[in-house]
Structures are given as structure tokens and as C-alpha cells.
């Protein structure tokens, strides 16, 4: 567990020509607030997908009134940090969306109105416990400068906030087998967890997730004895000239794996695949609980509060195995059609399509613009073998033959009313909702669901999206 912290340093016009008009005026004073949305992994989902790592809303900044004729300066910002608590491990790679919202405070019927001024997004690598990282992002003519960091909440420590520290049991030293935590010398580190299945007799580790073998043993889990003979086949060659003895039964005969483990022969010995809750060379060791941290790669451990009840690891996308120790190679199933390139991003699959093909799995064959007419003043746009019709306002469909009614799909959520507009559509939200599609509920106490609305609104305040 821990907290992602975001500090906004400035929001104002970016460098270069075309400085944006001030968002506030003497007639319509306004103030800014910010929303951050975090997702695990290097995600490429749309802005509307859930903020799986969490989201937060800033306080509202000071009221700002434009000075007539003056260029838009850096706008006054809310005080304090935006903090996004995370309950599980910090993923190390994450995607963010930071939105700058404007709250207009003019004499409007029904109270203030909100509109989205700018949205920036990015993908970053970040270790928990590290220093503040500085960033600059541009959205149109606006520029946002900010810093961010992830920090662990005690008792968690480490770059992923997965190691646990406990207060010392005695003032003089940590208990037997426990050492002080590096950043917190007055606390003690909880026991280390090696790679799942690492032999408790022949393997050891000094870093989480590793498995080093004692002399005489080998294999990823130190379950294979090192052979001293020169025999190369599993049972040894039958030729007497090699000087190798040929053992009779195979290593899996009689199934040496206890507790329902299944045996498979290896070049020198055997390996047991153990059921959940057992490990060791012959699956002889039981008593693993969630307290032992058996789930790797950010897996969530459920059950197993005592040694007699089995635990279950709920693996994040891209991992499998009883301890989430195996990375799933979903590209081996060749899901991308028509020669598309498969990218396994861990949290999701992506297909990079060859020119002339499109769709999530490159399943759509696109023609080019040759001999193709787009109706009602639409223009055919060609790009690397693909085509599409860019339709004039008020028309849609593959060939721009359909008259477009932007409100036909009922895009306004929660009872919002839709109005067709020359530039698209406008949603007039029902009381208690805000956002481009009335998708954000506003709660009376200022708290809000994710994504959230600005604090301090009363339930009866009608919301307008400008």
C-alpha cells in the first residue's frame, strides 16, 4: 500500500505563437481545479476507461479575473498535493491522465458551471520511494508543469511497496531472523519470500523472487541434483564402453511427489509440480499462507489465514500459475490477422496492423480511395493503403450518405438532455451530475465517485457542461 502524489507547479500558455485566450473574464471570473487518473502498466486505453490504480480531485484554486487586454498568464493554482492512495503493490509502470477543469463563477442561474480546459496523458516508469520526478506536458496551446512520486505507507517498503516492515519487538535489536529496514532503522523487516517453489532444502535466496542453489543442486528451483557422471541420457546409455551404469526404474516410478503433486522427469532427476499450498522437492512442505507473500508479479493473495487452509493467488493480466509466477505469452496464439504485429503489453494485447487493415485484431480489410466517392461533400482520406470518408458536418456513415443525428445514440448519461449543435452535441446534465456526457456524479459532501466532481456542491445544484 502507498500513495501516489502529484504536485502541480504551473498551468498557463505554452511557448510559441498562438497564445490561448484567458479562460476567465471580468464578466465570468473563474477558478481552476485538477483531476488525476492512474492506470497500471503502460496502458493505451481511452481516457474513459477505469482509473484502476485510483483517481483524485484537487481543491479549487483562487478566483481569477482576466485583466482586459493582458495575455493569459500562468493561472492561480489550488494549494496542496493531489494524492491517490493505492492498496496493493505499486506497479512500477503506470499511465496517467491529468485534466485541468475550469469552474465559472458568474451570475449563472443554478450556480457554477464546469468545463474541461486541457487534458494531458502519459506513460511512465517510477519506483516507489524514489525522488520527485518533474514533467512538462502540453495540451494544445496550454502547458502544464508538475512533479510526481510514489511513496509506501508503513509497514510497506521497497520499490513496489511489497516488502513489509514491523516495529521492533525489543529496543536493542530486531527479533531472531529479522533485520532493520534500510530506510527505517527503528523497524524490522518481515521475512523474505523467494521464487515460488524454490526448494526449502537445496535452494535459498537473498533477494525476493530469486532461487540460488546449494552446492550439488541445480535447476530453476534447485530440485535437480548435479550429476557427477558423464552419462547424458535420462537413464544413461546402455553401452558398457561409456562406463555408465543404467539404472532400472525411472525417477518418477512410484511417484515420489507427495500431497497430490505430479512428477515429470528431468535430464538428471525428476521435478514435482505441487498443488496449491505445498512446495519443496517432493511437495512435502505445507503451511504457506498469505502472510508468506506467495503471490508474485502483483498477484492478490486470498484466504490462507492459517497453515491448514490453502491460499489462492488472483493474478494480474499477463500472468498465470498458482503463484502468478508464469508470464502468459498471449501472442503465441497469433491473434493478429492479416500479418499484424502482436504486442503483449502485460495488461492487454495490441495488434499493430499492416497498411490497408484495421480493427482490434486487424480483421478489417480497408480499400483505398481509388474510384471511391464520399457523398454529401465528404472527402476520402487515404493513409498507407487505408481509407476513410471524412464527412461534412451533419453527415455520417461509411460513405457520408447518412444524415447524422448526434443525439440518436443517447450519449448523455443519467438523464441528461442532448442537443444537436453545429459542432456536434451538447449535454444538459440533470442535477447531481457533470461532465461532457454527464458521467460524473457529484456527491453532497464534496466526496465523489471516480472520476470525481469538484468538492463543495449541493445535491440540488444543476450542472452545465460548457
Amino acid at each position: 500500500a502507498g500513495v501516489f502524489e502529484l504536485q502541480i507547479h504551473s498551468f498557463g500558455p505554452g511557448p510559441g505563437p498562438g497564445a490561448p485566450r484567458s479562460p476567465c473574464s471580468a464578466r465570468l471570473p473563474c477558478r481552476l481545479f485538477f483531476r488525476v487518473c492512474l492506470k497500471p502498466g503502460l496502458s493505451e486505453e481511452a481516457a474513459e476507461s477505469p482509473c484502476a490504480l485510483g483517481a483524485a480531485l484537487s481543491a479549487r484554486g483562487p478566483v481569477y479575473t482576466e485583466q482586459p487586454g493582458a495575455p493569459a498568464p500562468d493561472l492561480p493554482l489550488p494549494d496542496g498535493l493531489l494524492q491517490v492512495p493505492f492498496r496493493d503493490a505499486w506497479p512500477g509502470t503506470f499511465s496517467f491522465i491529468i485534466e485541468t477543469w475550469r469552474e465559472e463563477l458568474g451570475d449563472q442561474i443554478g450556480g457554477p458551471a464546469w468545463s474541461l480546459l486541457a487534458r494531458v496523458a502519459g506513460r511512465r516508469r517510477l519506483a516507489a520511494g524514489g525522488p520527485w520526478a518533474r514533467d512538462i506536458q502540453r495540451a494544445g496551446a496550454w502547458e502544464l508543469r508538475f512533479s510526481y512520486r510514489a511513496r509506501c505507507e508503513p509497514p510497506a517498503v521497497g520499490t513496489a511497496c511489497t516488502r513489509l516492515c514491523r516495529p521492533r519487538s525489543a529496543p536493542s535489536r530486531c527479533g531472531p531472523g529479522l533485520r532493520p529496514c534500510a530506510p527505517l532503522e527503528d523497524e524490522c523487516e518481515a521475512p523474505l519470500v523467494c521464487r515460488a517453489g524454490c526448494s526449502p532444502e537445496h535452494g535459498f535466496c537473498e533477494q525476493p523472487g530469486e532461487c540460488r542453489c546449494l552446492e550439488g543442486w541445480t535447476g530453476p528451483l534447485c530440485t535437480v541434483p548435479v550429476s557427477t557422471s558423464s552419462c547424458l541420457s535420462p537413464r544413461g546409455p546402455s553401452s558398457a564402453t561409456t562406463g555408465c551404469l543404467v539404472p532400472g526404474p525411472g525417477p518418477c516410478d512410484g511417484n515420489p511427489c507427495a500431497n497430490g503433486g505430479s512428477c515429470s522427469e528431468t535430464p538428471r532427476s525428476f521435478e514435482c509440480t505441487c498443488p496449491r499450498g505445498f512446495y519443496g522437492l517432493r511437495c512435502e512442505v505445507s503451511g504457506v499462507t498469505c502472510a508468506d507473500g506467495p503471490c508474485f508479479n502483483g498477484g492478490l493473495c486470498v484466504g490462507g489465514a492459517d497453515p491448514d487452509s490453502a491460499y489462492i493467488c488472483h493474478c494480474p493480466p499477463g500472468f498465470q500459475g498458482s503463484n502468478c509466477e508464469k508470464r502468459v505469452d498471449r501472442c503465441s496464439l497469433q491473434p493478429c490477422r492479416n500479418g499484424g504485429l502482436c504486442l503483449d503489453l502485460g495488461h492487454a494485447l495490441r495488434c499493430r496492423c499492416r497498411a490497408g487493415f484495421a480493427g482490434p485484431r486487424c480483421e478489417h480489410d480497408l480499400d483505398d480511395c481509388a474510384g471511391r466517392a464520399c457523398a454529401n461533400g465528404g472527402t476520402c482520406v487515404e493513409g498507407g493503403g487505408a481509407h476513410r470518408c471524412s464527412c461534412a458536418l451533419g453527415f455520417g456513415g461509411r460513405d457520408c450518405r447518412e444524415r447524422a443525428d448526434p443525439c440518436a445514440a443517447r450519449p448523455c448519461a443519467h438523464g441528461g438532455r442532448c442537443y444537436a449543435h453545429f459542432s456536434g452535441l451538447v449535454c444538459a446534465c440533470a442535477p447531481g451530475y457533470m461532465g461532457a456526457r454527464c458521467e460524473f456524479p457529484v456527491h453532497p459532501d464534496g466526496a465523489s465517485a471516480l472520476p470525481a466532481a469538484p468538492p463543495g456542491l449541493r445535491p440540488g445544484d444543476p450542472q452545465r457542461y460548457l
Epitope: 531472523g177 521475512p191 523474505l192 535466496c205 519443496g280 512442505v285
Partner: nanobody
């Protein structure tokens, strides 16, 4: 709670022998490592020998290889350390340690591996 009780320490001349015992009266350790550690005044704790209960692995520090032997009698809930050809540098407080549940964290001669310890027995070797 798991208790470990060491005995067998004492004073001996260089070249002599001692046999240390570590008994667990309250708990039968069916699998996992048990080890012997020692600490001389002003020095770091040092792993001496370890044995895997329920397996066949024994490990020794280089300084005692060929002179010390670790063994276990599970029926008696006891682990032994037979120390032969003792040297003055073997003088120290000797501690017995056990894993309550076996796991692979840390080398068997690393004290961090163990979560139960005895109170120790003193060994003094004079020249």
C-alpha cells in the same frame, strides 16, 4: 511456543571433544533447517553447521569442516553437534536455531533464516 534448550557446553583442552545437544521439548520439527551458531565476545555471530530435518542435507562452515558433525534424532526431538579436535578459536557461546516452517529464504548458515533460538551454551577451549 517453541523452546530450544542447549546443553553440553563446558571447558576443554585444545584437541579435546564436546557434544552439544539442542532439545525442543514443546515442538516436533518434522521438516526444515536447524542450525548451530556461535558468537565470541566482540565478534559477529557465525553460522557453524546446519541440517535439514526430513531430508539429507548437512552444511558446515569452512572453519569447522572435517572436525564438527551435525546430526538429528527426530524421535528425541534433538539436534546434536559433535565437536572434535577443538581449537582455542572455537571458544564462544553456541546457539541452536530452528525454522518453524521451512522456506528457502536465506542460506542455512545465515542467522536470518531462523525464527527460534535457544539461550546458548558456553564452550571454552584452552591451550
Amino acid at each position: 511456543d517453541v523452546q530450544l534448550v542447549e546443553s553440553g557446553g563446558g571447558s576443554v583442552q585444545a584437541g579435546g571433544s564436546l557434544k552439544l545437544s539442542c532439545k525442543s521439548p514443546t515442538y516436533t520439527i518434522s521438516s526444515g533447517y536447524m542450525g548451530w551458531f556461535r558468537q565470541a565476545p566482540g565478534k559477529e555471530r557465525e553460522g557453524v553447521a546446519a541440517i535439514y530435518i526430513g531430508g539429507s542435507t548437512t552444511l558446515y562452515a569452512d572453519s569447522v569442516k572435517g572436525r564438527f558433525t551435525i546430526s538429528a534424532d527426530n524421535a528425541e526431538k534433538t539436534v546434536y553437534l559433535q565437536m572434535n579436535t577443538l581449537k582455542p578459536e572455537d571458544s564462544a557461546m553456541y546457539y541452536c536455531a530452528a525454522q518453524l516452517r521451512p522456506n528457502s529464504a536465506y542460506h542455512p548458515l545465515d542467522g536470518r533464516k531462523y525464527n527460534y533460538w535457544g539461550q546458548g551454551t558456553q564452550v571454552t577451549v584452552s591451550s
